[in-house]
């Protein structure tokens, strides 16, 4: 094939090599950019900045090499449009620093920075950590800071991410209240800070106030939906990012729902309870307190992380006719109490009883197709049945 006379020439099916001296000063309008997976750039002294717009449209890029060029600055968001980038070689350029933000969100298997006049500062603490942790092939490069010695020896005691303290109200918060949160940010070189409120949706009206180092957030007219929702304060400096999440507990009274008993491997009387603080529960059977045992007990399902409602079962292992009756679930917290009742009929007396035995009263049956080895349930359709033993 004839030699390629252009600044950049195809290399393989999806690669591009740009090696003609001084031909590029930016990466705009590279040919076939959309499908490129590999871009190799060398000897481009005029290529000094790499910014967000330069790599727009290179969404498939996996390997980027810019070596022996004049690169002085890589923008923190330079690789926003190249999320699949896995190998980045920026060796033998004029880079003094590289922000932690530049590589955040990438899954870099390899990062090569040797041959740059790096300046040891807290801004390279993230790179020092990569070296310590053996990431991206960094340890093998034995990176040096220009005139300062090895990067590994850089003092880092003062290189910390911001420290955040979020103040939440001590007092109980009720539905309809306004809540003021304050986020105090401490640390060196603070750059940005803010609130993440994505979980809040309709839980409150939000008003932000203040700025670094003290951010305010008012949650007005809060609802009970605010419970279990994260309110997150974040801040960044040249070392990295810190986040602290808090939750506001909004008090509201207990509520309870009961559902018809269902037969699974065992029997279950399903329930849902809600309230903040979480209500205490108590079962009654035919009006008397039900003592829980390994045959009859409360079983909770795994709670959802972002809501206060709890679902569960009153679980009955092999219930018999003596377990037929009225089940009541009482739920109470300091803000109110609630109850719900349901009739459950598991079966008629499965044991052949004598005429002098007491007459058991059976309540309306639970219509179910039993596949267990337990006694057959009643199938009559009458709402109440009285079983009478005839002598």
């Amino acid at each position: 094939a004839a030699p390629c006379p252009d600044a950049c020439c195809p290399h393989g099916s999806s690669g591009l090599r740009c090696t003609r001296d001084g031909a590029l000063d930016s990466l705009h309008h590279l040919p076939g950019a959309e499908n490129l997976t590999e871009l190799y750039i060398e000897n481009q002294q005029h290529l000094q900045h790499l910014e967000l717009r330069d790599l727009r449209g290179l969404g498939e890029l996996r390997n980027l090499t810019i070596v022996k060029s004049g690169l002085r600055f890589v923008a923190p968001d330079a690789f926003h449009f190249t999320p699949r980038l896995s190998r980045l070689n920026l060796s033998f350029n004029a880079l003094e620093s590289l922000s932690w933000k530049t590589v955040q969100g990438l899954s870099l298997q390899e990062l090569v920075l040797s041959g740059n006049p790096l300046h040891c500062s807290c801004a390279l603490r993230w790179l020092q950590r990569w070296e310590e942790e053996g990431l991206g092939g960094v340890p093998e490069q034995k990176l040096q800071c220009h005139g300062q010695g090895p990067l590994a020896h850089m003092p880092n005691a003062s290189c910390g991410v911001p420290t955040l303290k979020v103040q939440v109200p001590n007092a109980s918060v009720d539905v309809g209240d306004d809540v003021l949160l304050r986020c105090q940010v401490e640390g060196r070189g603070l750059e940005q800070a803010g609130w993440i409120l994505t979980e809040l949706e309709q839980s409150a009206t939000v008003m932000k106030s203040g700025g670094l180092p003290s951010l305010g957030l008012t949650l007005a007219n809060v609802t009970s939906d605010l419970n279990r929702k994260n309110v997150t304060c974040w801040a960044e400096n040249d070392v990295g990012r810190a986040e602290v999440s808090v939750q506001v507990n909004v008090s509201f009274p207990a509520s309870v729902q009961l559902h018809t008993a269902v037969e699974m491997h065992h029997w279950c009387i399903p329930f849902s309870v809600d309230g903040q603080p979480a209500p205490s529960l108590r079962w009654l059977f035919n009006g008397s307190v039900l003592n829980e045992t390994s045959f009859i007990f409360t079983e909770f399902l795994e709670p959802a992380a972002n809501e206060t409602v709890r679902h569960g079962c009153l679980r009955l292992n092999q219930p018999t006719h003596v377990n037929n009756g009225n089940y009541t679930l009482l739920a109470a917290n300091p803000f109110g109490q609630a109850s719900a009742s349901i009739m459950a009929a598991f079966m008629d007396n499965p044991f052949e009883f004598n005429p002098e035995d007491p007459i058991p009263v059976s309540f309306s049956p639970v219509d179910t197709n039993s596949t267990s080895g337990d006694p057959v349930e009643k199938k009559d359709e009458t709402p109440f049945g009285v079983s009478v033993a005839v002598g």
């Epitope: 045959f295 409360t298 018999t320 044991f351 009883f353 337990d374």
Partner: antibody, heavy 111, light 108 residues
């Protein structure tokens, strides 16, 4: 499958406290099962001591209730028995088991 | 009263059928479970509920209940069935568990 293993001293002085632990392996003690202790004096029958659920509910044999404590340690996936003020009449093989049907048993430990 | 009564000993000829019984007031209300225990070993559950057999238990073992009596039947007893058999159930209150005194089965 779930396995149970009792451990603890084989000898306790009269008036002392018997302490045994049952390690649960092959499953979580926080499952929908209760856990129980049963004992069997030499040459005699089985006696239920008590049961516990991982949320803290517990029931004891009325004849032993004043002397028995059963507890659960979820972090170690085990449950324990303490029997105070023991006498020679408490000499027995002590078993832990899975309730309510006692479908899994430890091998037992003689105290 | 909250107790379960078993015959202390029962014998059966090899290959014949034997019924081991358990009596108690609580059996009018609750199912019994049955356990087999061989010398020096922990008990093994053989029947629970109306007639539920755990996996690995031969189908010659079956359970039934009538009035205040629960029964364990072994149809075609084998030599390896020689053991002590215990019933248990909830007591009349439903709050505690109780065991029968045990039945020693001898296979002749």
């Amino acid at each position: 499958q779930v396995q149970l293993q009792e451990s603890g001293p084989g000898l306790v002085k009269p008036s002392g406290t018997l302490s045994l632990t049952c390690a649960v392996s092959g499953g979580s003690i926080s499952s929908s099962n209760w856990w129980t202790w049963v004992r069997q004096p030499p040459g005699k029958g089985l006696e239920w001591i008590g049961e516990i659920y991982h949320r803290g509910n517990r029931n004891y044999n009325p004849s032993l209730k004043s002397r028995v404590t059963i507890s659960v340690d979820k972090s170690k996936n085990q449950f324990s028995l303490k029997l105070s003020s023991v006498t020679a009449a408490d000499t027995a093989v002590y078993y832990c088991a899975r309730a309510p049907f006692f479908d899994r048993w430890g091998q037992g430990t003689l105290v | 009263s909250s107790e379960l009564t078993q015959d202390p000993a029962v014998s059966v000829a090899l290959g014949q059928t034997v019924r081991i019984t358990c009596q108690g007031d609580s059996l009018r209300s609750y199912y019994a479970s049955w356990y087999q225990q061989k010398p020096g070993q922990a008990p093994v559950l053989v029947i629970h509920g109306k007639n539920n057999r755990p996996s690995g238990i031969p189908d010659r073992f079956s359970g039934s209940s009538s009035g205040n009596t629960a029964s364990l039947t072994i149809t075609g007893a084998q030599a390896e069935d020689e053991a002590d058999y215990y019933c248990n159930s909830q007591d009349s209150s439903g709050n505690h568990l109780i065991f029968g005194g045990g039945t020693k089965l001898t296979v002749l």
